[in-house]
Interface confidence: medium
């Protein structure tokens, strides 16, 4: 992940908006504040991005290295099975789901976890880099 001087110089970082981080062809935004799942989704959409949809284990592993114990909303919901917001199924990882009333997905450094959607958590947005 490229954010100014933490991993490389800004000269080598293709432009992502301020406070966003670059990885591969995408920009990621890690929130500091907390919102419920729907409000997090709306925040991302308003910035021409989407609530994080993870494409493979490699991306998930890299993002988890950056995360703490705190859970962050991702674009994952249980609508007759766990699906990302684009409709694709979750197929490269399991999600820890304890109750059928917990229908939204969150991630921390250790796992994907189901939660009640109205819980206020941090979140991650993702969009294609310019």
């Amino acid at each position: 992940l490229c954010q100014g001087s933490k991993y490389s110089t800004c000269a080598s970082c293709p432009s992502c908006p301020d406070h966003w981080m670059k990885y591969g062809n995408h920009c990621y935004y890690f929130s500091v504040e907390k919102k419920d799942w729907i409000s997090s989704l709306e925040f991302c959409l308003a910035r021409d991005s989407h609530l994080l949809m993870i494409t493979d284990k490699q991306e998930m592993s890299l993002l988890q290295d950056f995360l703490s114990e705190a859970f962050h909303w991702v674009g994952l919901r249980n609508n007759s099975g766990w699906r990302w917001e684009d409709g694709s199924p979750l197929n490269f990882s399991r999600i820890y789901s304890n109750s059928l009333v917990q229908t939204c997905g969150a991630i921390n450094k250790n796992s994907l976890q189901a939660s009640s959607c109205e819980v206020s958590l941090q979140w991650v947005c993702k969009k294609v880099s310019p």
């Epitope: 419920d36 859970f71 820890y96 304890n98 109750s99 059928l100 009333v101 917990q102 969150a106 976890q113 189901a114 939660s115 009640s116 109205e118 819980v119 206020s120």
Partner: antibody, heavy 125, light 112 residues
Framework: QVTLKESGPGILQPSQTLSLTCSVS??????????VGWIRQPSGKGLEWLAH???????WYELALKSRLTISKDSSKNQVFLKIANVDTADTATYFC?????????????????WGPGTSVTVSS | DVLMTQTPLSLPVSLGAQASISCKSS???????????LEWYLQKPGQSPKILIY???NRFSGVPDRFSGSGSGTDFTLKISRVEAEDLGVYYC?????????FGAGTKLELK
């Protein structure tokens, strides 16, 4: 498969301390969003919430009984405990533990999705 | 405390008939987050309560579709479209929006 099971002394005398244990399986007491609550029901009467404890050890009590109640847990043993000090005949009831699901408010919750079968407690001299 | 008033306290029904139970709260139980944490539980004789409905109208997993919940604000209703023998017992409404969480006194559904 989620299960909860309560255990207690059955009978005790007024002024003693009631100790109850809720043994759970099928989920972890330390998992984000999980909690366990205690509810009691005097014979032939309705349900009364007593206390609940969250995954991170945050505890909440029924205000009128707070001075007499202590809830705790041992996540490694999958057990939740409730102590009621200085019991009286009015504490005679069936005591249930139930799993509660976090929705963002520590003080209240919206789903008790699994319950134990209950344990009967009689306070008598 | 939010008082949850259930009516009737006893409801004699015939198998196959419809049953309707009312629950009124002493104040609005719309939570500050916009959700209404009103649930219905069924307690069969000698058993622990089991959740039927959460957040006013959502059926819990495995609950037959003959059970339906509705209402808003302070007035809520549980309907059973065609009562079966296994539905008999005491029904409790419950609010989790305000501290302390509170139950209704219960409605006993019994055979006529």
């Amino acid at each position: 498969q989620v299960t909860l099971k309560e255990s207690g002394p059955g009978i005790l005398q007024p002024s003693q301390t009631l100790s109850l244990t809720c043994s759970v399986s099928g989920f972890s007491l330390s998992t984000f969003g999980m909690g366990v609550g205690w509810i009691r029901q005097p014979s032939g009467k309705g349900l009364e919430w007593l206390a609940h404890i969250w995954w991170d050890d945050d505890k909440w009590y029924e205000l009128a009984l707070k001075s007499r109640l202590t809830i705790s847990k041992d996540s490694s043993k999958n057990q939740v405990f409730l102590k009621i000090a200085n019991v009286d005949t009015a504490d005679t009831a069936t005591y249930f533990c139930a799993r509660v699901i976090y929705y963002g408010s520590r003080s209240a919750y919206y789903s008790m999705d699994y319950w134990g079968p209950g344990t009967s407690v009689t306070v008598s001299s | 405390d939010v008082l949850m008033t259930q009516t009737p306290l006893s409801l004699p029904v015939s198998l196959g008939a419809q049953a309707s139970i009312s629950c009124k709260s002493s104040q609005s139980i719309v939570h500050s987050n916009g959700h209404t944490y009103l649930e219905w539980y069924l307690q069969k004789p000698g058993q622990s309560p089991k959740i039927l409905i959460y957040k006013v109208s959502n059926r819990f997993s495995g609950v037959p579709d003959r059970f339906s919940g509705s209402g808003s604000g302070t007035d809520f209703t549980l309907k059973i479209s065609r009562v079966e023998a296994e539905d008999l017992g005491v029904y409790y409404c419950f609010q989790g929006s305000h501290v302390p969480v509170t139950f209704g006194a219960g409605t006993k559904l019994e055979l006529k």
